[in-house]
Amino acid sequence: MATQADLMELDMAMEPDRKAAVSHWQQQSYLDSGIHSGATTTAPSLSGKGNPEEEDVDTSQVLYEWEQGFSQSFTQEQVADIDGQYAMTRAQRVRAAMFPETLDEGMQIPSTQFDAAHPTNVQRLAEPSQMLKHAVVNLINYQDDAELATRAIPELTKLLNDEDQVVVNKAAVMVHQLSKKEASRHAIMRSPQMVSAIVRTMQNTNDVETARCTAGTLHNLSHHREGLLAIFKSGGIPALVKMLGSPVDSVLFYAITTLHNLLLHQEGAKMAVRLAGGLQKMVALLNKTNVKFLAITTDCLQILAYGNQESKLIILASGGPQALVNIMRTYTYEKLLWTTSRVLKVLSVCSSNKPAIVEAGGMQALGLHLTDPSQRLVQNCLWTLRNLSDAATKQEGMEGLLGTLVQLLGSDDINVVTCAAGILSNLTCNNYKNKMMVCQVGGIEALVRTVLRAGDREDITEPAICALRHLTSRHQEAEMAQNAVRLHYGLPVVVKLLHPPSHWPLIKATVGLIRNLALCPANHAPLREQGAIPRLVQLLVRAHQDTQRRTSMGGTQQQFVEGVRMEEIVEGCTGALHILARDVHNRIVIRGLNTIPLFVQLLYSPIENIQRVAAGVLCELAQDKEAAEAIEAEGATAPLTELLHSRNEGVATYAAAVLFRMSEDKPQDYKKRLSVELTSSLFRTEPMAWNETADLGLDIGAQGEPLGYRQDDPSYRSFHSGGYGQDALGMDPMMEHEMGGHHPGADYPVDGLPDLGHAQDLMDGLPPGDSNQLAWFDTDL
């Protein structure tokens, strides 16, 4: 049977003696990942002390002894007697210190120290010679061991191949003993025949003890590069993978640790483990309960899965996501949680594993550790959550996670804040429960504060602004959120983000947020006072010019600038101005910026969404008589009449409303003709509905919250922010849907149809529009 001493070779092998365990993992020759030993975290001490900074004398203790030790008084005679004894025994004290083995047994030598725990000066001076002597003895022993092993190895190799399993067992035990000594260990690893025999014996034996000894021997060899190479060349990897099926814990532990060392330090080992079916075996072992064993197993999985799609799919097929999530839910051992979170991080950039992790409850399980004192664990959980978050918008039971993420926005760690903002951005997309939850736990204030603190760090401001954009539309607390941004002094910084040095993705998000904030009448004046309107117009002009320039150069393809199409900016700015134009003072500013010619020009855009927002803003501006006249003077009647026939209901309705407002001062017969035109074009399918409005009494007054059509199949934009420590250049899902109606089936909110006052039944008669009429601003996009 295995002795306790044998078992103590394994840090994991259930031993109570923790010091022994630690010393094993900290052997200098042991090539481990540092998972358990932390061996790579400090420089080795040259003095042999644990920490060169620490003196090995406890000063307080010395002072205490100083005071205590001499409280006793001596007579002159006693002092003289003691002096005499010391003088007579000086040579013996030196000999005792230098060559203790030469002393006669039982001989008493008076010590010059009161406290036996402290060495005498002579003993201290003797330390170097003692060390030298030990070094010489060790060298002799090493040479003896090496010589003995060299002679023994050929015979032991034969015995390992013996027909008699009893002999094989004895040989295995002996080889294992030899492998514990450094010299003989080197001799073993330098014998390919011996290593092959060990490997063969290990996988062929039915004897538990033989399996344990051979696996233990390979484990001892794996602490050296030469040993790793010998194991690899001898076909040790398939044999060790086979041993992962052993019912004996010690064999299992030896096998997994040896494989771990191979994976870390031996070229070609990863491929060999994959080919031997190691991934399936390792995933099957995740139901074990020894935390140190699990830590090594999960680290092996991480090494194998990193940068290898096939491995990720094998882990998925073997039930890995569920098992890994269970570990995150069940255990508290930091190293295990950290290694498991690393595997999940690698898997979280795989489109097949992502939904499996989410469905296994991965979001909630990872969320449990976001307040852990271990920063490396928190960071891994956050990276993984961010990667998963775009696939988790339909998850239930996210309250705890959302609350923690809002708290983490207040962290001093920039990486933590970046991730928390990104996750909140995705989780608040198209999920009204999550939106309400975040609002209820102070998310608006936290996000505004985050944007204020972030300055021009766009990796924080962009996701934070996106999250605010989602929180300010399409849920019961949206109006509260729109007010809260203002009440927490967010409007100045939001408007500031429209200006340089902001890049297009951030500008796009900010424009969408401003559009949503403008839905709240209380924000109209502050946004105007902060100069939002001139900047939106400036951005609109610039983006429009850019699209025009490309068109004139014969380009039909929409081009991206920093990942944003300029058409999206045109659409966004126009849409924001449309909502801001609900306020009479804002309309004056908008008109004063000479925007009407541009809005009329946008009616000719080939993109329906741009047609719709352009018609929408003109509809608002046309409430004012001078503006209506200016619109007509710009020649808007022709394009508006054309748009009456648009298959996009929003476009047609806005066009009708502008034409109707432009006709306010026209003669009655003109109005009649217009009425017929509007009737025939707007109510092709339900002519009765128009008649019910009676004489076109369209009282287009103040705008309510626009009607919206919703679909429920969100598609997300994933974006790079390099260096997240992910698998290769895995995409980092941060953003929501793209703008515009360019992704059919996505959840795009409708930016709104005009509130036709008492003619609301006209609107009710409209069939639902297609996804192309939906705008991005409110982007839950």
């Epitope: 003995l148 002679r151 023994a152 190895i153 050929p154 015979e155 032991l156 034969k158 015995l159 013996d162 008699d164 009893v166 002999v167 004895k170 040989a171 035990v173 002996m174």
Partner: nanobody, 118 residues
Framework: QVQLVQSGGGLVQPGGSLRLSCAAS????????MGWYRQGPGKQREFVAS???????NYAASVKGRFTISRDNAKNTVNLQMNSLRPEDTDVYYC????????????WGQGTQVTVSS
Amino acid sequence: QVQLVQSGGGLVQPGGSLRLSCAASGSISSNNVMGWYRQGPGKQREFVASITDSDLANYAASVKGRFTISRDNAKNTVNLQMNSLRPEDTDVYYCRLTMMTAPPTISWGQGTQVTVSS
């Protein structure tokens, strides 16, 4: 130097019994295995049975249930009691002592003919 002296063997009818003995002399280490092997003309030497210093016995599948191995550590002897003998058990039987010294050593007896025939 270790010496192994075998005794027993001979001719026996199928179904009969025989007892082989082997005595070891010389400098024998305590950590050892004593066993029996057999070899026919032109054939490879084949393991039959063995026993450790702690009396752990091991048998080849072909003889299990028919042969019994035993040893006397004080006298450094090993015995093989062979029952229900079959014609295919006909071979030269060799005693072997494997000492787990450093390096290990293997010593062989001189061999004993066993013939099972009617």
